[in-house]
């Protein structure tokens, strides 16, 4: 849940190139206005995942997950949490 | 934001070597299954892509990485 | 117009040491990961090292590992190969060869060699 | 380390006829095969890269194809200027070369 709030675009993109769905990555990718080559480009690494099927999909999800939970990307995410705060509080 | 370890991660999967991506995922997930998968991905992301489709997948991270729903 | 270079090679005795450079020209050096390869006389190619475009990953074939350091410096457009400890059999023409953006393809340009004679 | 095994080591072929060069690799490497021709004195120089792709300003006589462990190098009608060694590399895991296959005109 947490990674998905750091940048929730980059984490739809992703997970529909991964998951395969050609539909869900059109939509995911229009909400960034790109372009043609652009999303031929995204459909070349979803046909990597397609061709190497669910296992393959999986643990990339897995990989993709362990490290958005890491404490590379956790540390980071309490600190901005933390920074956040305190502009808050000097705002008021 | 999108976190450094996530960028790094991605960067790596489309501008680096098969040797350098595995390497990066073993830092945090270190089976054996998980790195020859990484490895396959790799290799095959870098037989399907150019030049300009790695440069038009960079183009979109950062579209990405500079949205506001980001 | 993609230029390689190589320079540095000589005779040296067995324990010896030598440096290689590669000069590269025509293209935008440090966008691209370069390569060591070599070849003894009358045998085929043998990949020896190869570095990343930024200079913080290194490769090496197990033949060399723990003698040879490949390194560069953008700045100059130039890559190195630093020999240590040689033998009879480091004995090969060198070569450096850049390999496609983005690791698009292994050695798509290679330099001329030079060649490197380990010998008392 | 992945051991590259190319076959035969030397063939002998009369210009126009079809050459076919192989390339065995040790364990699955995809389709991260690149073919190299070596003229005498000269420095290799890439033919095809990815199994099946044609580098640019190669001649369309010279195609590769395969995927996982066997690759195939295949040059349609041979001229005297094909002369030369031929080598396989596999990027799948760090690089190796194929011991070379040594293409002479009859």
């Known amino acids: 849940v947490k990674m998905a709030e750091t940048c929730p675009i980059f984490y739809d993109v992703f997970f529909a190139v991964a998951n395969g769905n050609e539909l869900l990555l059109d939509l995911s990718l229009t909400k960034v206005n790109a372009t043609e080559p652009e999303r031929t480009a995204m459909k070349k690494i979803q046909d990597c995942y397609v061709e190497n099927g669910l296992i393959s999909r999986v643990l990339d999800g897995l990989v993709m997950t362990t490290i958005s939970s890491s404490k590379d990307c956790m540390g980071e995410a309490v600190q901005n949490t933390v920074e956040d705060l305190k502009l808050n509080t000097l705002g008021r | 934001e999108i976190c450094p370890a996530v960028k790094r991660d991605v960067d790596l999967f489309l501008t680096g070597t098969p040797d350098e991506y595995v390497e990066q995922v073993a830092q945090y997930k270190a089976l054996p299954v998980v790195l020859e998968n990484a490895r396959i991905l790799k290799n095959c992301v870098d037989a399907k892509m150019t030049e300009e489709d790695k440069e038009n997948a960079l183009s979109l991270l950062d579209k990405i990485y500079t949205s506001p729903l980001c | 117009e993609v230029q390689l270079v190589e320079s540095g090679g000589g005779l040296v005795k067995p324990g010896g040491s030598l440096r290689l450079s590669c000069a590269a020209s025509?293209?935008?050096?440090?966008?691209?990961?370069m390569n060591w390869i070599r070849q003894a006389p009358g045998k085929g190619l043998e990949w020896i090292s190869y570095i990343s475009s930024s200079d913080d990953t290194t490769y090496y074939a197990d033949s060399v590992k723990g003698r040879f350091t490949i390194s560069r410096d953008n700045a100059k457009n130039s890559l190195y190969l630093q020999m240590n400890s040689l033998r009879a059999e480091d004995t090969a023409v060198y070569y450096c060869a850049r390999d496609g953006k983005y690791n698009t393809v292994a050695g798509d340009h290679w330099g001329q060699g030079t060649l490197v004679t380990v010998s008392s | 380390e992945i051991v590259m095994t190319q076959s035969p080591d030397f063939q002998s072929v009369a210009p126009k006829e079809k050459v076919t060069i192989t390339c065995r690799a040790s364990?699955?490497?995809?389709?991260?095969l690149h073919w190299y021709q070596q003229k005498p004195d000269q420095s290799p120089k890439l033919l095809i890269k990815?199994?099946?792709q044609s580098f640019s300003g190669v001649p369309s006589r010279f195609s590769g194809s395969g995927s996982g462990t066997d690759f195939t190098l295949t040059i349609n009608s041979l001229e005297a200027e094909d002369a030369a060694t031929y080598y396989c590399?596999?990027?799948?895991?760090?690089?190796?070369f194929g011991q070379g296959t040594k293409v002479e005109i009859k």
């Open positions: 590399l596999q990027s799948y895991t760090l690089r190796t």
């Open positions: 025509g293209f935008t050096f440090s966008d691209y990961y």
């Open positions: 990815y199994a099946s």
């Open positions: 364990q699955n490497i995809g389709s991260s």
